[in-house]
Interface confidence: low
Amino acid sequence: LSTCKTIDMELVKRKRIEAIRGQILSKLRLASPPSQGEVPPGPLPEAVLALYNSTRDRVAGESADPEPEPEADYYAKEVTRVLMVDRNNAIYEKTKDISHSIYMFFNTSDIREAVPEPPLLSRAELRLQRLKSSVEQHVELYQKYSNNSWRYLGNRLLTPTDTPEWLSFDVTGAVRQWLNQGDGIQGFRFSAHCSCDSKDNKLHVEINGISPKRRGDLGTIHDMNRPFLLLMATPLERAQHLHSSRHRRALDTNYCFSSTEKNCCVRQLYIDFRKDLGWKWIHEPKGYHANFCLGPCPYIWSLDTQYSKVLALYNQHNPGASASPCCVPQALEPLPIVYYVGRKPKVEQLSNMIVRSCKCS
Amino acid sequence: LSTCKTIDMELVKRKRIEAIRGQILSKLRLASPPSQGEVPPGPLPEAVLALYNSTRDRVAGESADPEPEPEADYYAKEVTRVLMVDRNNAIYEKTKDISHSIYMFFNTSDIREAVPEPPLLSRAELRLQRLKSSVEQHVELYQKYSNNSWRYLGNRLLTPTDTPEWLSFDVTGAVRQWLNQGDGIQGFRFSAHCSCDSKDNKLHVEINGISPKRRGDLGTIHDMNRPFLLLMATPLERAQHLHSSRHRRALDTNYCFSSTEKNCCVRQLYIDFRKDLGWKWIHEPKGYHANFCLGPCPYIWSLDTQYSKVLALYNQHNPGASASPCCVPQALEPLPIVYYVGRKPKVEQLSNMIVRSCKCS
C-alpha cells in the first residue's frame, strides 16, 4: 500500500462538516434540528446574552484543558532525593517554641548538585511522613522568603489515620526560585490553619524526624523517613540537545496555520451554521472555528533502521510508541451556543468542539 | 478498500514492541543501549531502591493524568445563573460587624429550579466582581455547614488591580451538597486569610453588591454585577437517556481486558525487557504492562443516514467529530526505571509509557 496517495482536502472537509452536524445534534440529544415556528421576533433578551457572555468568559479565562507537554517533558527525568538539613543544625534554634508550626530547612547547594540549572527542574515534591493521629486538622505549607516573611504554597485537610502515611506537596516553583538565587539555607513552614476566630491554633499533626517530643520513638530516626525533596530533572548533558536545531513543535494554530507542514498538523476550518449546515436555529454564535487534524505520522522504527537517525524524530512523530500512530486532536475547547426550544431561549455549553492543536498518538 | 480485513495481532504487537524500543532509547537520548561492562556485581544499593520506590509511590499516589470524561460530560450543558439573595434580607443582619469576612447567601429553591437533581449538576461557579484595589491580599472561601460551622473550600492571592475584575471559584461540591439537602438558605463566607501571628486580619478586598460602604457607589447595584452562581447542568429530559441501555463505556483495562470488544479498546501487552527487547541494561523493573490501542472507530455520519439511529453511537465512536476517527491512548502513566551509566546507578522517570485506556479521536 502506498502511503503517498493524494489527500482530497475537500472531501476531508466535507466529512468533518457532516461529522460536526451529527456531533452537535448528538450532544443536544436531538434527533433533528428544533422547529423555529414559535421563536419570538427581535434580538435575544439581554439576560440571555449576559449569560452567554458569562459562559464565553469562562472559556476564555480558565480553560481546564491540559497544555500540550513542552518538548522537555517527553524526555526521561533523572530522579534524586535531597534530605532535610539535620535537626541539630543551629538554624532550627529560633523555631523551637512555636506551637502552630514546624520547620524544614534544605541546603540549596545539595539541590544544585542534583539540578545544576533552574530550567532543568521538571518537578519537585516535598515528602513528609505523618505519624498516626486521631484528630482531623487543616494544615498549610509556606515557603521561606528572604526578608524573613513566608509565602503561602498550599493546604491539605488531614483526616485521622491509624498508620504513618506519606504526604506529598508540589514545591516545584519554590525550588526553582531557590535555584535562581545563590546557595544557602532555604526552608518550608508546615503550619496549622489559623482561623480568624479560633483560639486553639496548635499544630496537632506530627511529622517523622521533626516533631520534637517524638524524636526518639522509633529509635534513631531512619534517614529514609525524615522529610526530603523528591526531584525530577532533565540531566545537564541531555539538556544541551534541547537547544539544538531539531525542536519538537507544538502542532497548534500558531505554527500550523502559518506553515506548509505536510505531516500531522491542525488545519483551518470555519463552520458557518447557515452556509455549511443549512441551520438557522442556532442564534449565537453564527459559526465557529472547528478546525481538524490531518497529515501523516510516519511509523519510524524497524529493526534495520539506524538508531541514531531515527531517535530525533521519535519525539515528533511517534512519542507514544504506537504501532500505527495517528494524527488526532490534543487541545480542545468548548463552544457555548444559544438556541430556542419553543419560545424559550437556552444557553448550552458543548464540550470539546474546537480543535486548538494536534498530536501524533 | 474493505475495512473488514483481518488484523494480524502478532504483527501489531511486534510493531508496538519495536516502537517501544525506540521510545525508551529516545527518551533517554541514547543512540544505543549503554554498555554494561563496569556495572558492579550484586544487588542495587538500598538508597537507589528507596529512590525508585519513592518514584513508584508517586505514580500510584497522585497520577496527574486527567480522568477519562464521564459519559455525561459529552452531552451539552444548560447554563443558568442564580443571583445572591438580596442584601436587604434579614439573614445578613448577624454578619454586619465582622471585619474579616463578607457573606453571600443563596436560596436552594432557586438552584433547584435550574438543577432538579444533584447528579445533573456538571459545574457550579461562584462569580464575584471585585472592585479596584491597591492592596495585595490572601483570601479564602468557606461553605456554610448546618451547625453554624464553616467548611474551607479554597483560597486565592489577589494582587492590586486598577479596574473591577471577576473572580471565579469552583463550588460544584458545595452546591451539589445543598441540592442533596432540603430547601433553605445556604451561604458562602469570603474571608481574609488569618495568619497565626498577624494581628491585622481585616478583609481589604471589596466585592460589588456586598461591601457595605461601597453600596451606592455605582448608583443602584446593577443585578448583573452582584455575586451569582453560574450553573452548568444536564437538562432533566436529556438525563433520562443516560440511564438507558446504550452507555458510553470507559475503554479502559477493566472493561477491555474482560470483554471481547471488536471496536476500539485497550489491548493487553506486557513487555519483558530481556525476552522482548533483548535488553539486560534496565535493572528495575524487569518489564511493564505497556498495552496498546486497537480496533475500528467507524465513521458514522452521512447525509443519507437516518439521524436518530446514528446519534446514540456518536458518543462512543466519534465524539470529536473527526473526518476519520482513530483509536488512540487516552489515559497514560509514567514508568520509573533504574539503569547504570558506567558504575553509577540512575533512577529515571519516563513519561506516558503505560496505556491505561483508549478513545476514538
Partner: antibody, heavy 120, light 112 residues
Framework: EVQLVESGGGLVQPGGSLRLSCAAS????????VHWVRQAPGKGLEWVSH????????YYADAVKGRFTMSRDNGKNTLYLQMNGLKSEDTAVYYC?????????????WGQGTQVTVSS | LPVLTQLSSMSGSPGQTVTITCTGS?????????LSWYQQLPGTAPKLLIY???NRASGVPNRFSGSKSGNLASLTITGLQAEDEADYYC????????????FGGGTKLTVL
C-alpha cells in the same frame, strides 16, 4: 592549569558596540557557570552578568540589562559579552571569572582583564 | 551605595592581626548565601581567598581565615606581612536584588 584570557576591549564612542571574548582552558568549560565582573578606574568591583553551564540561564545587573548579552560556545570553550548602546559609565576593566562549583557565585579563577573605554 | 558595607581603609604593622568586616542583611549574608573574600594586589586581577564564609581557597596561607555571624562577615589576617597590602572585597549573592550578586565597596589595607 586553569586559564581565562579576555580580549576585544578598546576605545568606542557612546552608543557604539563592542564584543568581548574570554577563552578558557585547563578545566571542563561546559561544567561551570561563568561571570563578567568589571572595575571602573579607581573604583570597586561590580558584578555584570552570569551564564550557567549549559547556557540555559543568563542573569544581568540592572545597569546593563537590555544592552548587554552574554553567550557561550562550549565547543570552542569561549565566553562572549556583546555590549551595545555603550555609555561613558561602562568604562572599566572587564574580567571574566569562573564559578568554584557549578553556579555558586564564588569566583576561583579570573582573567587578567580587558580595558573598555567609552568616550567621544 | 554598596549593599555590603566595608570600611574603606585600614592599616596595621607587620606581625599584627587585623580584622576586616563586611556588614550585610538577611537577604544576603544573613540569608545563608555563599560569602566570599577576594584579594586584589595593585595592578592585578582579584584572587579568591575565602569561599563559603570560612573555607580557605587552595594555595591561600592559613594566616587568612573567615567567619560569619548573623549579618556580619569577617576576614582575619594574623601575622600581617608586607605582601598583604592590597584591596580586599567581600562578595555575596543577594536575593532581594534583581541584580543577584553584590560586592562590598572594598577595604584598602596598608601595611605600615
Amino acid at each position: 592549569e586553569v586559564q581565562l584570557v579576555e580580549s576585544g576591549g578598546g576605545l568606542v564612542q557612546p552608543g557604539g558596540s563592542l564584543r568581548l571574548s574570554c577563552a578558557a582552558s585547563g578545566f571542563t568549560f561546559s561544567n561551570y557557570g561563568v561571570h563578567w565582573v568589571r572595575q571602573a578606574p579607581g573604583k570597586g568591583l561590580e558584578w555584570v552578568s552570569h551564564i550557567s553551564a549549559a547556557g540555559i540561564s543568563r542573569y544581568y545587573a540592572d545597569a546593563v540589562k537590555g544592552r548587554f548579552t552574554m553567550s557561550r560556545d562550549n565547543g570552542k570553550n569561549t565566553l562572549y559579552l556583546q555590549m551595545n548602546g555603550l555609555k561613558s559609565e561602562d568604562t572599566a576593566v572587564y574580567y571574566c571569572a569562573k564559578d568554584r562549583i557549578r553556579s555558586s557565585y564564588e569566583y576561583d579563577s579570573w582573567g587578567q582583564g580587558t580595558q573598555v573605554t567609552v568616550s567621544s | 551605595l554598596p549593599v555590603l558595607t566595608q570600611l574603606s581603609s585600614m592599616s596595621g604593622s607587620p606581625g599584627q592581626t587585623v580584622t576586616i568586616t563586611c556588614t550585610g542583611s538577611s537577604s544576603n549574608i544573613g540569608g545563608g548565601y555563599y560569602l566570599s573574600w577576594y584579594q586584589q594586589l595593585p595592578g592585578t586581577a582579584p584572587k579568591l581567598l575565602i569561599y563559603n564564609a570560612n573555607n580557605r581557597a587552595s594555595g591561600v596561607p592559613n594566616r587568612f581565615s573567615g567567619s560569619k555571624s548573623g549579618n556580619l562577615a569577617s576576614l582575619t589576617i594574623t601575622g600581617l606581612q608586607a605582601e598583604d597590602e592590597a584591596d580586599y572585597y567581600c562578595g555575596c549573592y543577594d536575593s532581594s536584588l534583581s541584580t543577584g550578586y553584590v560586592f562590598g565597596g572594598g577595604t584598602k589595607l596598608t601595611v605600615l
